[in-house]
């Protein structure tokens, strides 16, 4: 497994280890910052972001932010630490493998945000209600 001389050095904020000594590679996320988007009135959309980045820190997760105002629609894709708010909102769904969009209250625009923790999971953003875990039927399926 991990050589002992390496293991001694892994206790810093850039490294996450498990009980078996495995080391977590940082998340791979789509990272195009803010781009104009054509994603509108769809159950799900692809980010159309061609840049996949290795997140800077292993605790970071993938985030997508969809915004619509009178002038345009934008989609933001980034890595972010779920311990810290993003756009003043807590990343409640950071452990989710899928990026399920949740609407947030922002004056003057429609604002949706999602976060997730599987590789490149912010490439496919999901608006459809059928994925929403507040749906009791879905919860039944998940926990069966």
């Amino acid at each position: 497994t991990i050589p002992p001389h390496v293991q001694k050095s892994v206790n810093n904020d850039m490294i996450v280890t498990d009980n078996n000594g495995a080391v977590k590679f940082p998340q791979l996320c789509k990272f195009c910052d803010v781009r104009f988007s054509t994603c509108d009135n769809q159950k799900s959309c692809m980010s159309n972001c061609s840049i996949t980045s290795i997140c800077e820190k292993p605790q970071e997760v993938c985030v997508a932010v969809w915004r619509k105002n009178d002038e345009n629609i934008t989609l933001e894709t980034v890595c972010h630490d779920p311990k810290l708010p993003y756009h003043d909102f807590i990343l409640e769904d950071a452990a989710s493998p899928k990026c399920i969009m949740k609407e947030k209250k922002k004056p003057g625009e429609t604002f949706f945000m999602c976060s997730c923790s599987s590789d490149e999971c912010n490439d496919n953003i999901i608006f459809s209600e059928e994925y929403n875990t507040s749906n009791p039927d879905l919860l039944l399926v998940i926990f069966q």
Partner: nanobody, 119 residues
């Protein structure tokens, strides 16, 4: 038993090139993601690059993007790291590592090969 054996390190001048190899055995190499990680003297680990099992999708840390190229030859069970335009700050021990289950957790590491960039 899983074994990873790195080679190809050495002393090189700034601006020079090196090609690291990692010979893998004890597992089905073609089924696992692989990565290169480095540790500079007195510093922590830094992830350098990762390659998917199919060899097509590759990922790089910003510090090496455009200079380093990761590749693999699944028929030879070997992982490579081509390092060009080397800088003093690339001086480190370079390790190859094997993904546990395509989930970003790397459970087996080689013993490392030292790359020294100095004039």
């Amino acid at each position: 038993e899983v074994q990873l054996l790195e080679s190809g390190g050495g002393l090189v001048q700034p601006g020079g090139s090196l090609r690291l190899s990692c010979a893998a055995s004890g597992f089905t190499f073609s089924e696992y993601d692989m990565a290169w990680v480095r540790q500079a003297p007195g510093k922590g680990l830094e992830w350098v690059s990762r390659i998917r099992s199919d060899g097509v999708r590759t990922y790089y840390a910003d510090s090496v993007k455009g200079r380093f190229t990761i590749s693999r030859d699944n028929s030879k069970n070997t992982l490579y790291l081509q390092m060009n335009s080397l800088r003093a700050e690339d001086t480190a021990v370079y390790y190859c590592a094997k993904d546990r289950a395509k989930n970003g957790w790397f459970d087996y590491w080689g013993q490392g090969t030292l790359v020294t960039v100095s004039s």
